[in-house]
């Protein structure tokens, strides 16, 4: 089938295009090219007769067309008007006609665009700005760049007019940027020069520096004012409402107390028409003033908050000092001083940080102290304690429990029995109790300021019979001559007598034995290995008695000075040397041997077969107890004689 291919399809103005013919039939008489999608004599471009090789221009011929023998048509120096369809009409020798249509599009080389703006000096938070990319060009795509980046997504940015117009609503100072537009068509892309958006803003509230407001008589006062503003603000100073000067800085040398007052800086933007003022109160002291402490947090929460204490007033060229609890500041990673020592920061306050705190200002002659400041640290509640500590009660008595938890402000208390709320009091009182009053008694403490709650649960048993007691110990493996051991008979019961037995005997009289806590606690001071015995406690009241199981005290001791056996020190050559070392110790010690100072083996027994005089020397046994951390040793001299020279010598093992 006859087809036409346009090379290229998108043609730049001024270039050329080839309408290339594919599948041209054979045995042709001639062919003609027409502008448009059909054969129209008025729109013929050129005709070609093969027999004569004669090309004949038609009405639509422009002088820029060249026809080739293969029927392809080259159009040079393309103009915009050339866009469209082209039809090839082929006449075969049998006078049967065939047609094919091709097309191409002509695009101009785009001109360099420029940006026009409807507002060259928009005012922040008030004006909108519309940028338009010029000129308007047919079949062109428009793009925008801000600071060489594609447009950010923002509800204040809007594209319209086929993306040719970029509108910024409610401009802000951050819209001050470089804006460029780009135009594209299939054959070229162009970019404008950048336009810088000049947003008028401010003035913002001015800042007066330096920040210090307290001065000494005789100093120079040098205040500077600055307000963010475009164009830059014009400044005026007022003292106590009276205009002084139109400068950014105010300088008054050698000030006196009379220069105290309110200092106002007024910033004015002539383009936006806005004014903003800031007032600072300057105090000039004849003498250094009495300092005082300000705090950024009057009720800090323990382990949560930091507190910054600042010594006021701020005075230039002054030394600030601090005291806590009438002492100079302790070294602590939680205490931080600012560079000028004026601010003391307590990181992660605790209940012990209440103070009092004092600051001082040092002058030439003395130090002026502030009044003390006490911190009100909110803490707790800690785990509540329920008293008394009895857990067993007899029927018929009164049960009176009191709850207390360290807390600031003081905790609010609630009592629950077996999970059921009883009352919101610190004390719980039940008269004439019975077995039915046995159960889990919970005290809940709540701190309304910190919002924290803590609970403690106590099991109360009401029974005529006393339970079987048990012994608790504060040290399961005491070291001899070093540790003390406290045995406590559990549980604590009301109106109960506590008794103790050692190895089935009543307690011996000894200054190292002490009973306390109503005989409920037995303390052994400076335990010895002889205290390793069976201890039993008993409880009794008017209706019952009971004894605990025995608890044997495991006293760690030793090692004592070791003994080497046999005791012989002289041996005959050829005998076997078999030395055994023993030291009293709990737990058993580790043994090691040295001969003439040289380490040998880590065994209790040292064996050397067929000794010779070469085995003469000092034999040392070393013992160590890892549990007590103690060591000991003994040295024995061994002499080996040649056979038969020393009668009466041991023959060895």
């Amino acid at each position: 089938k006859l087809t036409i291919e346009s090379t290229p399809f998108n043609v730049a103005e001024g270039k050329e295009v080839l309408l290339l013919v594919h599948n041209l039939p054979q045995h042709l008489f001639g062919y003609s090219w027409y502008k448009g999608e059909r054969v129209d004599g008025n729109r013929q471009i050129i005709g070609y007769v093969i027999g004569t090789q004669q090309a004949t221009p038609g009405p639509a011929y422009s002088g820029r067309e060249i026809i080739y023998p293969n029927a392809s048509l080259l159009i040079q120096n393309i103009i915009q008007n050339d866009t469209g369809f082209y039809t090839l009409h082929v006449i075969k020798s049998d006078l049967v006609n065939e047609e094919a249509t091709g097309q191409f599009r002509v695009y101009p080389e785009l001109p360099k665009p420029s940006i026009s703006s409807n507002n060259s000096k928009p005012v922040e938070d008030k004006d909108a700005v519309a940028f338009t990319c010029e000129p308007e060009t047919q079949d062109a795509t428009y793009l925008w760049w801000v600071n060489n980046q594609s447009l950010p997504v923002s509800p204040r940015l809007q594209l319209s007019n086929g993306n040719r117009t970029l509108t910024l609503f409610n401009v802000t100072r951050n819209d001050t940027a470089s804006y460029k537009c780009e135009t594209q068509n299939p054959v070229s892309a162009r970019r404008s020069d950048s336009v810088i958006l000049n947003v008028l803003y401010g003035p913002d509230a001015p800042t007066i520096s330096p920040l210090n407001t307290s001065y000494r008589s005789g100093e120079n006062l040098n205040l500077s004012c600055h307000a963010a503003s475009n164009p830059p603000a014009q400044y005026s100073w007022f003292v106590n409402g009276t205009f002084q000067q139109s400068t950014q800085e105010l300088f008054i040398p050698n000030i006196t107390v009379n220069n105290s007052g309110s200092y106002t800086c007024q910033a004015h933007n002539s383009d936006t028409g806005l004014n903003r003022t800031t007032v600072t109160t300057i105090t000039v002291y004849a003498e250094p003033p009495k300092p005082f402490i300000t705090s950024n947090n009057s009720n800090p929460v323990e382990d949560e908050d930091a507190v910054a204490l600042t010594c006021e007033p701020e005075i230039q060229n002054t030394t600030y000092l601090w005291w806590v609890n009438n002492q100079s500041l302790p070294v602590s990673p939680r205490l931080q001083l600012s560079n000028d020592n004026r601010t003391l920061t307590l990181l992660s306050v605790t209940r012990n940080d209440v103070g009092p705190y004092e600051c001082g200002i040092q002058n030439e002659l003395s130090v002026d102290h502030s009044d003390p400041v006490i911190l009100n640290v909110l803490y707790g509640p800690d785990d509540p304690t329920i008293s008394p500590s009895y857990t067993y009660y007899r029927p018929g008595v009164n049960l009176s429990l009191s709850c207390h938890a360290a807390s600031n402000p003081p905790a609010q208390y609630s009592w629950l029995i077996d999970g059921n709320i009883q009352q919101h009091t610190q004390e719980l009182f039940i008269s004439n109790i019975t077995e039915k009053n046995s159960g889990l008694y919970t005290c809940q403490a709540n701190n309304s300021a910190s919002g924290h709650s803590r609970t403690t649960v106590k099991t109360i048993t009401v029974s005529a019979e006393l339970p079987k007691p048990s012994i608790s110990s504060n040290n399961s493996k005491p070291v001899e001559d070093k540790d003390a051991v406290a045995f406590t008979c559990e549980p604590e019961a009301q109106n109960t007598t506590y008794l103790w037995w050692v190895n089935g005997q009543s307690l011996p009289v000894s200054p190292r034995l002490q009973l306390s806590n109503g005989n409920r606690t037995l303390t052994l001071f400076n335990v010895t290995r002889n205290d390793a015995r069976a201890y039993v406690c008993g409880i009794q009241n008017s209706v019952s008695a009971n004894r605990s199981d025995p608890v044997t005290l495991d006293v760690l001791y030793g090692p004592d000075t070791p003994i080497i056996s046999p005791p012989d020190s002289s041996y005959l050559s050829g005998a076997n040397l078999n030395l055994s070392c023993h030291s009293a110790s709990n737990p058993s010690p580790q043994y090691s041997w040295r001969i003439n100072g040289i380490p040998q083996q880590h065994t209790q027994v040292l064996f050397i077969a067929k000794i010779t005089p070469n085995n003469n020397g000092t034999y040392a046994c070393f013992v160590s107890n890892l549990a007590t951390g103690r060591n000991n040793s003994i040295v024995k001299s061994i002499t080996v004689s040649a056979s038969g020279t020393s009668p009466g010598l041991s023959a060895g093992a």
């Epitope: 730049a12 080389e109 793009l143 060489n148 070229s188 892309a189 162009r190």
Partner: nanobody, 123 residues
Framework: EVQLVESGGGVVQPGGSLRLSCAAS????????LGWFRQAPGKEREFVAA????????YYADSVKGRFTISRDNAHNTLYLQMNSLRPEDTALYYC????????????????WGQGTLVTVSS
């Protein structure tokens, strides 16, 4: 102003591939549109491909369309030309060109040019 240095040229057999690079320095790379041009011995300088500032627009000469791909890496200040299915008629000195305001096939639109890198397609 921007300086351009081409590399990656060489001798390759017909049907083979090459990747040309153009390294830019001296100015913000993303401020420039870029193009590749070539000049065969005894012939006029010919447009090959162009790419705009952001890389979203490309334009190719008909003779290379479908075989060559132009791309840019603004982060590394480099322009590329991936050339596949090379033909003997692709033999030429390949130039990289830059313009702050024009991307297209017209060499007069590009004020900045590199020294070129030679591509030879031969069996």
């Amino acid at each position: 102003e921007v300086q351009l240095v081409e590399s990656g040229g060489g001798v390759v057999q017909p049907g083979g591939s090459l990747r040309l690079s153009c390294a830019a320095s001296g100015h913000t790379f993303s401020e420039y549109a870029l193009g590749w041009f070539r000049q065969a011995p005894g012939k006029e300088r010919e447009f090959v491909a162009a790419i705009n500032w952001g890389g979203g627009w490309t334009y190719y000469a008909d003779s290379v369309k479908g075989r060559f791909t132009i791309s840019r890496d603004n982060a590394h200040n480099t322009l590329y030309l991936q050339m596949n299915s090379l033909r003997p008629e692709d033999t030429a000195l390949y130039y990289c060109a830059a313009s702050s305001d024009y991307a297209g096939g017209n060499p007069t639109g590009y004020p900045y040019w590199g020294q070129g890198t030679l591509v030879t397609v031969s069996s």
